[in-house]
Amino acid sequence: SAGAGSHCQKTSLRVNFEDIGWDSWIIAPKEYEAYECKGGCFFPLADDVTPTKHAIVQTLVHLKFPTKVGKACCVPTKLSPISVLYKDDMGVPTLKYHYEGMSVAECGCR
Amino acid sequence: SAGAGSHCQKTSLRVNFEDIGWDSWIIAPKEYEAYECKGGCFFPLADDVTPTKHAIVQTLVHLKFPTKVGKACCVPTKLSPISVLYKDDMGVPTLKYHYEGMSVAECGCR
């Protein structure tokens, strides 16, 4: 799995809704693949981490003043939806086909 | 200044183009306010850090399994342009009025 020593990438993160207390309203799925963005944003920032100009600047400043300025951070830059079956306010099971922003599609350095 | 113990916020970061080697092509300004996103993304994530659903989920999983999953990260969520005067290949000064993504407008937890 990607640690701090490896470069920014998408890694598996299985989330169980019971673990986070969301099983009280999400009926299904019981768990899903959320993914996680892990790893460092090291100089030089590669194209695959789609760095913004600010991330490039911050990386260069970090090189020069590592104690003063942090590195850019490996974060989700694009998210995907999942489908969930949930209980509405009246306890009626309802399907949300497109529950936005739940799973990582892409990671990058920001 | 915002450290890891404080919550995610925008802090000052004056960038000198000479420090990062960009003075070879940027004539002016000599330095600019880039800002930096600093601080932690702690539970519960406040509205002002505009968390995505994935950031909320990751924060909850981190609470449950702090050694397995990292916290969400404080990063620029909106960037602003600056104007730069640069030297072209012939050494002629030319203005880029809207040089995108150079300065942080907003920080958030992602």
Epitope: - | S80, P81, S83, D89, M90
Partner: antibody, heavy 114, light 110 residues
């Protein structure tokens, strides 16, 4: 020596069209972001729009009063900038300058009148 | 009404010092990016300076400063050939391009 020379101005009726050109020399045209700025008679300067270099995406941006009516394009092989003006209005009457921000042409007068 | 406010006119006698102000009245304009143009009668505008860059051929009698939400152009040792219009210009983030002040007509008296 940097030179920007505009042409194509003239008298046109409201609703008509006109295409302005700006011939450039003395700098690396393909790298430059180029703008059109206009000045109505006796008035101040007003930004019309800008085109980025191809390496920066070649995208265009326009001021609200001209959006949807004016189109900026460039031909890097000819070192020429263009401004296609459609659905012209009397309030478009002005001297039109092309500029790199640092250098400006002498301008070309566009008069929209019936 | 321009979001950069200049006085419509200014005047002085030869040898005097004249200051022209430019006030930012919109949060989309960053005072850091304000610069100045000179337009002499019947001529195209000419860049006076941008940040601390002064194009070759521009007299060092012209200088600029910024404070709070205002920028100023100072001309020392006023000369008759300085007569004309002076425009401040800034970067309008919302408009994605430069915005110009209304212009100040400088008259050299006597």
């Amino acid at each position: 020596e940097v030179q920007l020379v505009e042409s194509g101005g003239g008298l046109v009726k409201p609703g008509g069209s006109l295409r302005l050109s700006c011939a450039a020399s003395g700098f690396t045209f393909s790298n430059a972001w180029l703008s059109w700025v206009r000045q109505a008679p006796g008035k101040g300067l007003e930004w019309v729009g800008r085109i980025k270099s191809k390496t920066d995406g070649g995208t265009t941006d326009y001021a609200a009063p001209v959006k949807g009516r004016f189109t900026i394009s460039r031909d890097d092989s000819k070192n020429t900038l263009y401004l296609q003006m459609n659905s012209l209005k009397t309030e478009d009457t002005a001297v039109y300058y092309c500029t790199t921000g640092t250098y400006w042409g002498q301008g070309t007068l566009v008069t929209v009148s019936s | 009404q321009s979001v950069l406010t200049q006085p419509p006119s200014a005047s002085g006698t030869p040898g005097q010092r004249v200051t022209i102000s430019c006030s930012v009245t919109n949060s989309d304009i960053d005072i850091d990016n304000v610069h100045w143009y000179q337009q002499l009668p019947g001529m195209a505008p000419k860049l006076l300076f941008f940040h601390d860059y002064r194009p070759s051929g521009v007299s060092d009698r012209f200088s600029g400063s910024k404070s709070g939400t205002s920028a100023s152009l100072a001309i020392v040792g006023l000369q008759s050939e300085d007569e004309g219009y002076y425009y401040c210009a800034g970067l309008d983030v919302a408009m994605r391009g430069p915005v110009f002040g209304g212009g100040t007509k400088l008259t050299v008296l006597g």
